[in-house]
């Protein structure tokens, strides 16, 4: 399976929600010794592979933020720990998952990594990622409300083994 | 890795200057760029900075006087109606986990003087 | 904002224990916004810790950042005479235009 990133680039202004969007493509094995993991964290941009640091959202980790379902099944986080954190992520049963950030702040700008992992009992597991940039302005350049830019479709394949 | 700021000299009050900040080994559309001065045995204050977008935000007291522009391996700041409590080294820093603040990478500074 | 330091000089001995305080008027970002730097006379500012606890790379381990919201702490153990120097907290607020840095804390070994 791939994960795509519909959008590389999202610009959005101070205060402004914004959900940031990956989706699973390809055969998705939905056997009972199949489970999907997935989870949303921070990394830096510049590193020579892309999405390999892991860093927090708003304090939360990569832990903190994961759904864990098999298959296609639709899922949330535990609301209370994100909400708190303005944060939310979700997974449908199309195989699009998200997190949704609210009331955007400048440091929330930076390059935020979606993450798959396949886990098969007793065999090995198999991870993709994908990863877009988010970034938040205020002031006369500002927009008035998210802007989306969407990736290549190269990008929007991205199956970096992590 | 590198960042370098260079166009520090001695000024008369009001005279306008830019200092330029030069980076290499890195791209300027991957990392934000933040300003910090120092004046002569005082502590660090933090001027602005630049996103990855190009927007640039400031620090209340540098706002309509300081202006923060870049090109594709450099940052300028651009300094209008100089005092002498301008009299200050100028660091120009790369900001590595975009915030405005965490500068990881940083140049040697740059003297600007402003006397009469 | 404002961040108040520990005042300076603080001295140490060679192979003892310092600790240097931040205190901010208001929270920072996330609660953890926060970095230590390190500056010795005539030289640019050094990144040690960001997010208030985590260390920069090649610092020393000897370095530790610890708190949340607005009380912070840099602890230096194992203290060298290399460690002299004068080191800053700074912070990053939801409102960048709160952005400050500590007014500087002077370590001195002994």
């Known amino acids: 399976f791939k994960v795509a990133t519909p959008y590389s680039l999202y610009v959005c202004p101070e205060g402004q929600n914004v959900t940031l969007t990956c989706r699973l493509l390809g055969p998705v094995d939905k056997g009972h010794d199949v489970t999907f993991y997935k989870t949303w964290y921070r990394s830096s941009r510049g590193e020579v592979q892309t999405c390999s640091e892991r860093r927090p959202i708003r304090n939360l980790t990569f832990q903190d933020l994961h759904l864990h379902h098999g298959g296609h099944q639709a899922a949330n986080t535990s609301h209370d720990l994100a909400q708190r954190h303005g944060l939310e992520s979700a997974s449908d049963h199309h195989g699009n998952f998200s997190i949704t950030m609210r009331n955007l702040t400048l440091l929330d700008s930076g390059l935020y990594c979606c993450l798959v992992v396949e886990i098969r009992h007793h065999h090995s597991e198999h991870r993709v990622h994908g990863a877009m940039e988010l970034q938040v302005q205020t002031g006369k350049d500002a927009p008035s409300n998210c802007v989306v830019y969407p990736s290549s479709s190269q990008d929007s394949e991205n199956i970096t083994a992590a | 890795q590198s960042v370098e700021e260079s166009g520090g000299r001695l000024v008369t009050p009001g005279t306008p200057l830019t200092l330029t900040c030069t980076v290499s080994g890195f791209s300027l559309i991957s990392y934000w760029m933040i300003w910090v001065r120092q004046a002569p045995g005082e502590g660090l204050e933090w001027i602005g900075f630049?996103?990855?977008?190009?927007s640039a935000y400031y620090a209340s007291w540098a706002k309509g006087r300081f202006t923060i522009s870049r090109t594709s391996t450099t940052v300028d700041l651009k300094m209008t109606s100089l005092t002498t409590e301008d009299t200050a080294t100028y660091f120009c820093?790369?900001?590595?986990?975009?915030?405005?603040?965490?500068?990881?990478?940083w140049g040697p500074g740059t003297l600007v003087t402003v006397s009469s | 904002a404002v961040l108040t330091q520990t005042p300076s000089p603080v001295s140490a001995a060679v192979g003892g224990t310092v600790s240097i305080s931040c205190q901010s008027s208001?929270?920072?970002?996330?609660?953890?916004?926060l970095s230590w730097y390190q500056q010795k006379p005539g030289q640019r500012p050094k990144l040690l810790i960001f997010y208030a606890s985590t260390l920069a790379s090649g610092v020393p381990s000897r370095f530790k950042g610890s708190g949340s919201g607005t009380q912070f702490t840099l602890t230096i153990s194992d203290v060298q005479c290399d460690d002299a120097a004068t080191y800053y907290c700074a912070g990053a607020y939801t409102n960048y235009n709160d952005n400050a840095f500590g007014g500087g804390t002077e370590v001195v070994v002994k």
């Open positions: 208001k929270s920072v970002s996330d609660n953890n916004w």
């Open positions: 630049i996103n990855t977008g190009g």
């Open positions: 820093a790369r900001a590595r986990y975009d915030s405005y603040i965490t500068g990881d990478l």
